[in-house]
């Protein structure tokens, strides 16, 4: 019995659902009563899911698997694995027995995008050309381990004094911290590029340093020029700093964070103590760093609704303020592709290809391309619907007349994360069925 599975690993984002495709060709008169279908982990032989004696025996794998029961009779033995975890990565074997027996193994490659790196500079005051500084680039909750590249403002690699560490958390996701020690020139941009090798997703952060003395007078409050990009569900640091004068004590400090537009209070430090969060109890200051001029705000479990501008007010004797923008983002899932009609296709047939990608933010850009990368702009309809958390589900439909053969690719781009998720359908010149059986 010939059992077909994809040659390439199935790539699934942590937290999304994955389909491990497996198919066989049922003979005429085949009934499900004849079928024994077993999915198991290839290495350990642990049972994952089974269908025997004419019925679904259910999931033996943390109750997170399901078969496509309505498609089983047509030879679709695929397995749906829900809420993918890092620990799921590996090889799954699909055993099919009717009268004959066949099996094949499919690999699951788990991935998670890295957050936009946050950049910190030490020391960060009174910098002069010739000073040695430490620039730290931190990017969170990605998988698998990242590749980290440092570049100057012209793109030249900075390979000198770089130390990169990657630590896995309890879910197996990696936090990356890369430290560059560099001697300052007259001015310079230092960029850190964190690459997810599986998703081919690059997240980058930059810091531009113009060494000079700060002007005296009003309190100079520094915030990042670029928006702080935070993934939904992660924590974000809204950086804000000031330069305390000699003899400064926290008793002199009034620090207020508020929403720029509505002036809603977010967090405050006055009268020498932390007055706490006024923003759903999800904010915190870095109290141990406040005396050194670090007025940054930590915003926990970021939501879409948090997007916008936050103002950092600092008053000692003088007064200063600056606003920092928070840009919320969520990666789109790998698109699922459906084809209608999906049987006995011939050149000249008109088909509808649907590309669906879920739970991203902000709204996606959708591109359709043929196998050579040429855009397919003809008959395309794209809709994007926000769920109750404000995350978008994208559905894009392409109507196309089949040629002798062709690949139709849908690319769903997150414009903020610069993350592309794509799915493809390849249709050959022979009469065929989708998903392909070979």
């Amino acid at each position: 019995l010939e059992v077909q599975v994809p040659e390439d690993p199935v790539v699934a984002l942590v937290g999304t659902d994955a389909t491990l495709r497996c198919s066989f060709s049922p003979e005429p008169g085949f009934s499900l009563a004849q079928l024994n279908l077993i999915w198991q982990l290839t290495d350990t032989k642990q049972l994952v899911h089974s269908f025997t004696e004419g019925r679904d025996q259910g999931s033996a794998y943390a109750n997170r698997t399901a078969l496509f029961l309505d498609l089983l009779a047509q030879g679709n033995a695929s397995l749906r694995l829900q809420r993918v975890r890092v620990a799921d990565e590996g090889s799954f074997t699909c055993f099919v027995s009717i009268r004959d027996f066949g099996s094949a193994a499919v690999s699951l490659q788990v991935a998670a995008p890295y957050s936009k790196p946050s950049m910190t500079l030490e020391p960060n005051k009174d910098l002069r050309p010739g000073d040695t500084v430490t620039i730290t680039c931190s990017s969170y909750r990605g998988y698998p381990e990242a590749e980290v590249f440092w570049q100057d403002g012209q793109g030249a690699p900075l390979t000198g004094n770089v130390t990169t560490s990657q630590m896995a958390n309890e879910q197996g996701l990696f936090d990356v911290h890369s430290v560059l020690r560099v001697v300052l020139g007259a001015n310079g941009t230092y960029s850190c590029l964190v690459r997810n090798p599986v998703l081919q997703q690059d997240a980058h952060g930059s810091i531009t340093i113009t060494p000079q003395r700060s002007p005296t007078g009003a309190v100079e409050v520094q915030v990042p020029e670029d928006p702080v990009v935070a993934l939904v569900g992660t924590d974000a640091t809204l950086r804000c700093s000031f330069s305390p004068e000699p003899g400064f004590s926290l008793a002199q400090l009034n620090l207020i964070w508020q929403l720029t537009d509505t002036k809603q209070l977010v967090h405050s430090f006055t009268e020498g103590r932390d007055q706490g969060s006024a923003y759903a109890n999800r904010t915190a200051l870095f109290l141990d760093l406040l005396a050194q001029g670090n007025a940054s705000l930590r915003l926990q479990r970021v939501r879409v609704a948090d997007e916008g501008s936050f103002t950092c007010f600092v008053s000692i004797r003088d007064f200063g303020s600056a606003a920092v923008s928070l840009q919320v983002a969520a990666p789109y899932s790998k698109p699922s592709m459906t084809l209608e009609p999906n049987k006995d296709l011939r050149p000249g047939d008109t088909v509808t290809i649907t590309c669906s990608s879920y739970r991203g933010y902000p709204e996606a850009e959708v591109f359709w391309q043929d196998g050579q990368g040429a855009p397919l702009t003809g008959n395309v309809t794209t809709s994007q619907m926000a769920n109750e958390q404000g995350l978008f589900d994208v559905h894009s439909v392409l109507r196309v007349v089949l040629g002798a053969n062709g690949t139709y690719s849908c690319l769903v781009r997150n414009p903020v994360l610069q993350q592309d998720a794509h799915g493809s359908v390849t249709i050959t010149g022979q009469p065929m069925t989708f998903p392909p059986e070979a």
């Epitope: 403002g153 012209q154 793109g155 690699p157 001015n187 960029s191």
Partner: antibody, heavy 120, light 106 residues
Framework: EVQLQQSGPELVKPGASVKISCKTS????????MHWVKQSHGKILEWIGG????????TYNQKFKDKATLTVDKSSSTASMELRSLTSEDSAVYYC?????????????WGQGTLVTVSA | QIVLTQSPAIMSASPGEKVTMTCSAS?????MHWYQQKSGTSPKRWIY???RVASGVPARFSGSGSGTSYSLTISSMEAEDAATYYC?????????FGAGTKLELK
């Protein structure tokens, strides 16, 4: 449409200097570094250096450090390269090429090239 | 500096033939780019980040490799593929190119 339009061919005498330009359009000039590449008659490509129009930072191939000076004019979205103390070895086609920073995407767009001929 | 050695220097292929050219680095590099140049025109980015095919490049082109050994492959040669192909690295300074592989139509 992204375009990198280079200045015309130059015939210069040995020992002289020449300044060639690369006028850009179709994108935000300050968001990309501009690099320069030499292609001599043997078809060998050599990287000269690059400049970040945003802050004016430059990175040079040490081989060309005393030969080339890179500048930008943000107001006209134009990058320029001056070559000095020219010899016959400097006769070549010089290309400007756009580079997204930071990235590992290589030179995504190239100018059409400027032929510099050094001859007495 | 990292020296990139391309081989062969010149090769020819018939239409439909599979073509592979290589680029060997004197030290390990993180990624490789490939450019196509036809006579009298500027180089064009063809493959970047080792294996990513640039926009508009036919799907018959692919790139692979790691460390010191990289290659560009054409699954089925076509007349329009006749050109010179250059590899390029910038994992360490200075940025360097290979001397090129000239691909001719047989």
């Amino acid at each position: 449409e992204v375009q990198l339009q280079q200045s015309g061919p130059e015939l210069v005498k040995p020992g002289a200097s020449v300044k060639i330009s690369c006028k850009t359009s179709g994108y935000t000039f300050t968001e990309y570094a501009m690099h320069w590449v030499k292609q001599s008659h043997g078809k060998i490509l050599e990287w000269i250096g690059g400049i970040n129009p945003n802050i004016g930072g430059t990175t040079y191939n040490q081989k060309f450090k005393d030969k080339a000076t890179l500048t930008v004019d943000k107001s006209s979205s134009t990058a320029s390269m001056e070559l000095r103390s020219l010899t016959s070895e400097d006769s070549a086609v010089y290309y400007c090429a756009r580079f997204l920073v930071p990235s590992t995407e290589g030179f995504t767009y190239w100018g059409q090239g400027t032929l510099v001929t050094v001859s007495a | 500096q990292i020296v990139l050695t391309q081989s062969p220097a010149i090769m020819s292929a018939s239409p439909g033939e599979k073509v592979t050219m290589t680029c060997s680095a004197s030290s390990s590099v993180s990624y490789m780019h490939w450019y196509q140049q036809k006579s009298g025109t500027s180089p064009k980015r063809w493959i970047y980040d080792t294996s990513r095919v640039a926009s508009g490049v036919p799907a018959r082109f692919s790139g692979s490799g790691s460390g010191t050994s990289y290659s560009l492959t054409i699954s089925s040669m076509e007349a329009e593929d006749a050109a010179t192909y250059y590899c390029q690295q910038w994992s360490s300074n200075p940025l360097t190119f290979g001397a090129g592989t000239k691909l001719e139509l047989k």
